[in-house]
Interface confidence: low
Amino acid sequence: PRSIDVKYIGVKSAYVSYDVQKRTIYLNITNTLNITNNNYYSVEVENITAQVQFSKTVIGKARLNNITIIGPLDMKQIDYTVPTVIAEEMSYMYDFCTLISIKVHNIVLMMQVTVTTTYFGHSEQISQERYQYVDCGRNTTYQLGQSEYLNVLQPQQ
């Protein structure tokens, strides 16, 4: 069998809401994946599991099942949404994200995604990790790749 290539393209949109009483930020982050089937037979994308981390803490998880079938030598673009919550010990971020004196409230999030594909009863998992900028201060739609966090240095521990 030939390879199945998974490429994490980036954040497509981030929709934000706040709870002033709980000092909590809710971010619905939609991501885009390109999945390429290099085989001469169809492949089923069985599930996508994703999680988002902020400052080494998991703030959101999502799982999509029975997603699609990719034909021979074909590519499909798949969007998936991860609901995230920044709260409790990270509630200090609430003030940053709601400060009107700041125009762009970018935070760095680590996107992790695992794609499970099946063909002829065989299962294969491909994982990706990527750091992305997301604006926690307003609803934002991104040009694909625009939210890439290019700095090779990891966020401080």
């Epitope: 809401s17 706040y18 709870d19 002033v20 009483q21 709980k22 009107i100």
Partner: antibody, heavy 123, light 112 residues
Framework: QVQLQQPGAELVKPGASVKLSCKAS????????MHWVRQRPGQGLEWIGN????????HYNHKFKDKATLIVDKSSSTAYLQLSSLTSEDSAVFYC????????????????WGQGTSVTVSS | DIVMTQATPSIPVTPGESVSISCRSS???????????LFWFLQRPGQSPQLLIY???NLASGVPDRFSGSGSGTAFTLRISRVEAEDVGVYYC?????????FGSGTKLEIK
């Protein structure tokens, strides 16, 4: 239309407890915080606390912490205020009022109020 | 706790006149997100309170535009232009920036 239905009156003996109800209709119960407010005869309004019906998250005025318990029953869209160890000082009208969801830009908060339940503590 | 002060217990007014009701808070109610978390309520005799103004200056649904709210972070004013007989009652300010939420003691509007 939005309605918050409260019983008109409750007569309770000193030392007893009472559970006041506030039945919500005309909106999605779990999308709106429910607040409780006390008004003693001839006095002003005092905020007792509130509860988020979606997850039962509560906040209390510390003044009422040992006196009041807020609970909800999602299946019947009803909020309850339980008052314990009642004395004549607890005689008052108790209002429930809903506010919009917690989003910081939430607009018309505490926009609907019940008619209030008059609690009289007397032997 | 944030203390809300309504220093004027009652205001007599003639129908058709304008009136201002004041309220002060012991701490600024201006949040970093730009909103000022102050309500104004009217409680007519024998009735439940009714929301008039939210976030200091926003008119609640169904409230006549004779009512308006203004203020800074700690000093607030409810203005009623052309007072009508139905405006009588007790006016309360309330902060909902911090728990516990707190009300002012109320200002009674009376017709002369």
């Amino acid at each position: 239309q939005v309605q918050l239905q409260q019983p008109g009156a409750e007569l309770v003996k000193p030392g007893a407890s009472v559970k006041l109800s506030c039945k919500a209709s005309g909106y999605t119960f779990t999308n709106h915080w429910m607040h409780w407010v006390r008004q003693r005869p001839g006095q002003g309004l005092e905020w007792i606390g509130n509860i988020d019906p979606s997850d039962s998250d509560t906040h209390y005025n510390h003044k009422f912490k040992d006196k009041a318990t807020l609970i909800v029953d999602k299946s019947s869209s009803t909020a309850y205020l339980q008052l314990s160890s009642l004395t004549s000082e607890d005689s008052a009208v108790f209002y429930c009022a809903r506010s919009r969801g917690g989003y910081y830009d939430y607009g018309e908060a505490m926009d609907y109020w019940g008619q209030g339940t008059s609690v009289t503590v007397s032997s | 706790d944030i203390v809300m002060t309504q220093a004027t217990p009652s205001i007599p007014v003639t129908p058709g006149e304008s009136v201002s009701i004041s309220c002060r808070s012991s701490k600024s109610l201006l949040h970093v997100n730009g909103n000022t978390y102050l309500f104004w309520f009217l409680q007519r005799p024998g009735q439940s309170p009714q929301l008039l103004i939210y976030r200091m200056s926003n008119l609640a649904s169904g409230v006549p535009d004779r009512f308006s709210g203004s203020g800074s972070g700690t000093a607030f004013t409810l203005r009623i232009s052309r007072v009508e007989a139905e405006d009588v009652g007790v006016y309360y300010c309330m902060q909902h920036l911090e728990y516990p939420f707190t009300f002012g003691s109320g200002t009674k509007l009376e017709i002369k």
